[in-house]
Interface confidence: low
């Protein structure tokens, strides 16, 4: 008898909150055994799969899709789906990314014209993070 | 409008677990990533842990590991010093990511260690 | 293990004159560089990010250039409420790190 699958999770690094030109890290989460997940946009048939799985816990599978620059368009509805074989997961809740056009904090004025906002904390490796491993995934440039 | 403030920080002795807890007003905790740094009456800054939105991932300065634990609630973010000694004598400040860097700092709190 | 090497430690500096404070990392840290400002008694002030992205409300007397390991805050035109300690800040790595902060340099503005 096949098992029931659990419902995967989804989370964003460092936040859901993105200033323009900053890098963001979407983090899927499922059981043990997962050899594909997916990331996927709202309204659109558009996704991105990575076989880039970690463990991040005996119980626990990670995958992590990151985007380097964020754009306007990367504003919208994202989730996780997996395949453990031999079937396909439910999709995890909706995650909402929100694109500050913003220079000094969220309540700034617009960025100047040929001006970026500066990337989010990015922690390179996660050697002090019993949560995430090792590996940071695959880029999701391609999912848009 | 938007703030951070940190609250918990009084006179302990050593030994004694002490928490504590960074309100955040005006925005959501769950969007964005927090920092804790201390400063040691007339020293510089030093970076104690930060905790990410989302998944609540928690990174630590090494001299940290073990010695503090960072948590958040849905309205909080809790820094825990499991055993003080008179080292931890410090302001506690909280503070906001935003770019490479952090844009909003609670005023701090402070924490006494003494016998 | 990444650190941030701050210089001078203590610069004393006219009024209207111009100041450069000098960040060097241990490894390369691409952009990820910040500057804060801090009076005694307050908190620290972000004034600048990843490297050259001014914060709001920061006058453009301060400025941040630099990328990889070697980083520069130039404070132009001097004023005495610029007299304070300035703090560099790292937001790359957060592995085997010591601090994110660099030492600090304090101005004294004469």
């Known amino acids: 008898q096949e098992e029931d699958l659990p419902r995967p999770s989804i989370s964003a690094e460092p936040g859901t909150v993105i200033p323009l030109g900053s890098h963001v890290t979407f983090v899927c989460r499922g059981p043990v055994g997962v050899q594909t997940f997916r990331l996927e946009r709202d309204s659109r048939s558009t996704y991105n799969d990575t076989e880039d799985v970690s463990q991040a816990s005996p119980s626990e599978s990670e995958a992590r899709f990151r985007i380097d620059s964020v754009r306007e368009g990367n504003a919208g509805l994202y989730r996780c789906i997996y395949y453990k074989p031999p079937k396909w997961s439910e999709q995890s809740d909706y995650l909402e990314l929100l694109v500050k056009e913003s220079s000094g904090g969220p309540d700034s004025p617009d960025t100047e014209p040929g001006s970026s906002a500066g990337p989010t904390q990015r922690p390179s490796d996660n050697s002090h993070n019993e949560h995430a491993p090792a590996s940071q995934g695959l880029k999701a440039e391609h999912l848009y | 409008e938007q703030s951070v403030e940190e609250s918990g920080g009084r006179l302990v002795t050593p030994g004694t677990p002490l928490t504590l807890t960074c309100t955040a007003s005006g925005f959501s905790l769950s969007s964005y990533a927090m920092i804790w740094v201390r400063q040691a009456p007339g020293e510089g800054l030093e970076w104690i842990g930060d905790?990410?939105?989302?998944?609540?991932a928690t990174y630590y300065a090494s001299w940290a590991k073990g010695r503090f634990t960072i948590s958040k609630t849905s309205t909080t973010v809790d820094l825990k010093i499991t055993s003080p000694t008179t080292e931890d004598t410090a302001t506690y400040f909280c503070?906001?990511?935003?770019?490479?860097?952090?844009?909003?700092w609670g005023p701090g709190t402070l924490v006494t260690v003494s016998s | 293990e990444l650190d941030l090497t701050q210089t001078p430690a203590s610069v004393e500096v006219a009024v209207g004159g111009t100041v450069t404070i000098k960040c060097q990392a241990s490894q390369s840290i691409s952009s990820y560089l910040s500057w804060y400002q801090q009076k005694p008694g307050q908190p620290p002030k972000l004034l600048i990010y990843?490297?050259?992205t001014m914060a709001s409300g920061v006058p453009s007397r301060f400025s941040g250039s630099g990328s990889g390991t070697q980083f520069t805050l130039t404070i132009s035109d001097l004023e005495c409420a610029d007299a304070a300690t300035y703090y560099c800040?790292?937001?790359?790595?957060?592995?085997?790190?010591?601090?994110?902060f660099g030492g600090g340099t304090e101005v004294v503005v004469k």
């Open positions: 905790i990410y939105a989302g998944g609540g």
């Open positions: 503070a906001r990511a935003y770019g490479s860097g952090y844009d909003l």
């Open positions: 800040q790292q937001g790359d790595s957060r592995s085997n790190v010591d601090n994110i």
């Open positions: 990843y490297a050259s």
